[in-house]
Amino acid sequence: EVEKTACPSGKKAREIDESLIFYKKWELEACVDAALLATQMDRVNAIPFTYEQLDVLKHKLDELYPQGYPESVIQHLGYLFLKMSPEDIRKWNVTSLETLKALLEVNKGHEMSPQVATLIDRFVKGRGQLDKDTLDTLTAFYPGYLCSLSPEELSSVPPSSIWAVRPQDLDTCDPRQLDVLYPKARLAFQNMNGSEYFVKIQSFLGGAPTEDLKALSQQNVSMDLATFMKLRTDAVLPLTVAEVQKLLGPHVEGLKAEERHRPVRDWILRQRQDDLDTLGLGLQGGIPNGYLVLDLSMQEALS
């Protein structure tokens, strides 16, 4: 808390300009009118204030707007936004996409901070829905934002937004989310050549159905084990030993190390042991020779 002190003669700020960087903290508090600051917020960003000076400016705005800043001020906060707490931001009512973009730009290149998460939450709640323009903006700044959305919300994501997504952005997505994102990615990357297509689609394959995995197995893709282990179990189970061998290429040897883990474990249980033996990996647990496999799910459907 800065003590209230009278402004020295001749130092009263007439406008927000570079001369203020030479003011001590107490002088800023005493000599800068909060209303003047609010109307000239756009100038603050261009002036190399210290963090301590920015604290004073924030304090002045807090005093002027105890119920929360108006959007006219918020839009021009610039680097002062980094000084805001989530509690401050919860008091705001942000409705303009331009305001959102301006503040996201300040935090660009960094992980999504609690401040940004709160800002986005306030913005989306204020709008009442996640419209296409908002989604395009958010995925452009934070492609990983997709994994924080429900499958229902993801259904409105346009395929064009998928281009901005990078492998690391999907690290936190669960299978239900990938189920929605995969067909969009397929559409987005459809014009790419085979090898580039596979690398681009790879991080979305946790949502791929069996028929697409079968198709990929015919394309000499050499899927790595990390990707294979993220595939849907129900999509992997119907694959034959030959298809998995083609899908993984030289990485097929890695199945041995994963034989106790899903989906490999479940897949092994569905294969004939003599088919598994053709891999020469010593995989055990397949259906012994001479046994019949009854598909009980089909039987139930018929009865």
Partner: antibody
Framework: QVQLQQSGAELMKPGASVKLSCKAT????????IEWVKQRPGHGLEWIGE????????NYNEKFKGKATFTADTSSNTAYMQLSSLTTEDSAIYYC?????????WGQGTLVTVSA | QIVLTQSPAIMSASLGERVTMTCTAS???????LHWYQQKPGSSPKLWTY???NLASGVPARFSGSGSGTSYSLTISSMEAEDAATYYC?????????FGGGTKLEIK
């Protein structure tokens, strides 16, 4: 076939700005990232940043924030990089490249020389 | 950011000799996103191998790539004169995208 044609060499004064262009042909311009890479004489390759023309989305290497600005004109299939407040350290060849899953196609490069 | 360190920085090899250059990443990179480029003086870089071990179009079969995690390599089974160039490894896995410092391969 895919081609990236870059603008010609530039001789600039310190403090000036320069805008380099990269015209893309032979593919859907809006659907691939355009990457910008710097190479100083005798040095390696340094990633500056990228732009996705379809959305205007940009990402910058922290080192080049404030130095480089990317834009794209989808009507002419051209990407631009503006370099501001030039110093002799900015003398280099600047490449644009098309990235899908890797930098598959490269422009011929633009040599920028900054000299008083 | 992921730092890629190439070694050696400069090497010379006789025609017909087997050549191996390495690229070490400061943190793990998926093999799908580790690529190599060849550059000759006065020319732009060219994609040479993609996703660690796949040869780009037109690259001779004497080249091969391998590796995983933090350790990758590019090998020429039998050096030829046209292979003299600088080779850069590159990760396109985690932004910012980075290149190794390059290995300059000369003819002995």
């Amino acid at each position: 076939q895919v081609q990236l044609q870059q603008s010609g060499a530039e001789l600039m004064k310190p403090g000036a700005s320069v805008k380099l262009s990269c015209k893309a042909t032979g593919y859907t311009f809006t659907g691939y990232w355009i990457e910008w890479v710097k190479q100083r004489p005798g040095h390696g390759l340094e990633w500056i940043g990228e732009i996705l023309p379809g959305s205007g989305s940009t990402n910058y290497n922290e080192k080049f924030k404030g130095k480089a600005t990317f834009t794209a004109d989808t009507s002419s299939n051209t990407a631009y990089m503006q370099l501001s407040s030039l110093t002799t350290e900015d003398s280099a060849i600047y490449y644009c490249a098309r990235a899908g899953a890797w930098f598959a196609y490269w422009g011929q490069g633009t040599l920028v020389t900054v000299s008083a | 950011q992921i730092v890629l360190t190439q070694s050696p920085a400069i090497m010379s090899a006789s025609l017909g000799e087997r050549v191996t250059m390495t690229c070490t990443a400061s943190s793990s990179v998926s093999s799908s996103y580790l690529h190599w480029y060849q550059q000759k003086p006065g020319s732009s870089p060219k994609l040479w191998t993609y996703s660690t071990s796949n040869l780009a179009s037109g690259v001779p079969a004497r080249f091969s790539g391998s590796g995983s995690g933090t350790s990758y390599s590019l090998t020429i089974s039998s050096m030829e004169a046209e292979d003299a160039a600088t080779y850069y490894c590159h990760q396109y896995h985690r932004s910012p995208w980075t290149f190794g410092g390059g290995t300059k391969l000369e003819i002995k």
